[in-house]
């Protein structure tokens, strides 16, 4: 198995996922494409945790670029052995993967909490409330109750869709980073497959 190519593949995947996370999080600030709710602070509290922008986004780009860099041919050597440096790099990628696990984990947790609590919306009495907070997430199964939110229009669908996307993307990122931890440990300890498909023993 070529650990470097695997890492690079994971890296590119993470860049795409991170950008999607950032986009999904940004969309949460503009229900129905309107800016008024963000400016009036009428958004779910979990939107302000920047879970997709920071956790599943920016924090994920660091390990992503580290993983992509592992496949470069001009990887620095150590002790006069080029491959030794590559092994060091693979092991250091484990640290980057752990940062990714923390970021994606944060994204998943916040998205799950956002889904469970439901959106901040104008209820049938004209109050800004977390209308579904007391339902312990049961509102997700009963779409007939979603009309209790009168403004922003389709806010429940908006929040559920985007937090679900963040939850899924964060989950995929978490799994990929976990794979890279295993990949990095195996690549660092058991050797590194170079472009010439050479295998070196530890």
């Amino acid at each position: 198995m070529c650990y470097g190519k695997c890492a690079r593949c994971i890296g590119h995947s993470l860049v795409g996922l991170a950008l999607l996370c950032i986009a999904a999080n940004i969309l949460l600030y503009f229900p129905n494409g309107e800016t008024k709710y963000a400016s009036e602070n009428h958004l779910s509290r979990f939107v302000w945790f920047f879970s997709g922008i920071v956790g599943g986004g920016l924090l994920m780009l660091l390990p992503a670029f580290v993983f992509i860099g592992l496949e470069q041919d001009d990887c620095c050597g150590c002790c006069g052995h080029e491959n030794c440096g590559k092994r060091c790099a693979m092991l250091s990628s484990v640290l980057a993967a752990l940062i990714g696990i923390a970021g994606s984990g944060y994204c998943v947790i916040v998205a799950a909490l956002g889904l469970a609590e439901g959106p901040l919306c104008l209820d049938s009495l004209g109050q800004w409330n977390y209308t579904f907070a007391s339902t312990e997430g049961q509102y997700l199964l009963d779409t007939s109750t979603w009309s209790e939110c009168t403004e922003p229009k389709h806010i429940v669908e908006w929040n559920v869709s985007l937090f679900s996307i963040l939850l899924a993307l964060g989950g995929i990122e978490f799994i990929l980073c976990l794979i890279q931890v295993i990949n990095g440990v195996l690549g660092g300890i058991c050797g590194f497959c170079c472009s010439h498909q050479q295998q070196y023993d530890c």
Epitope: D123, S124, L125, G126, Q127, W128, T150, E151, P152, K153
Partner: antibody, heavy 120, light 106 residues
Amino acid sequence: QIQLVQSGPELKKPGETVKISCKASGYTFTNYGVKWVKQAPGKDLKWMGWINTYTGNPIYAADFKGRFAFSLETSASTAFLQINNLKNEDTATYFCVRFQYGDYRYFDVWGAGTTVTVSS
Amino acid sequence: QIILSQSPAILSASPGEKVTMTCRANSGISFINWYQQKPGSSPKPWIYGTANLASGVPARFGGSGSGTSYSLTISRVEAEDAATYYCQQWSSNPLTFGAGTKLELR
């Protein structure tokens, strides 16, 4: 000056339709909701429901579903209450009320009221 | 629905006297609003959020309470205070008003 100006008194026969207007001035109409309150002669106040002036979405209290309709003419900063198939028990003064979405939600500006008399 | 019971229905007082009217809910609510209505006029916001005086309301008025029991107090009644006072809750759907307390001056 913030005010809600309501249309004049109405005398109607049972089965007829009445449409009351409530014109807002002195504030941004779409930033506040408009609620409607009924007060029958010698009786207490009864909340009929409200209309979201931003989305146009009407919400009706259980006792006022069916014959009652809230609507808007946003360009004229005006809210309307229409009562169809009038009954004697609809005889009352109807108030339109502005309310704000603050920490303590209350009716901060009231219209003078429109008296509707239903009599055959 | 939450039912608000106001007592007394009619309250007679002499100028300078201290008076208290109460509003009880059949279930716990988070706050209450009070409105003053004089004959032939629309109600005016008087006290909101249980204890906050609306704009232009004299400082002799005060509000207090929590849970199911709320009250409006006038430290020294004046002739202009003669009116009907309604309490209103906004904690539960439907929004409801009390039947009112009519304050008469002797």
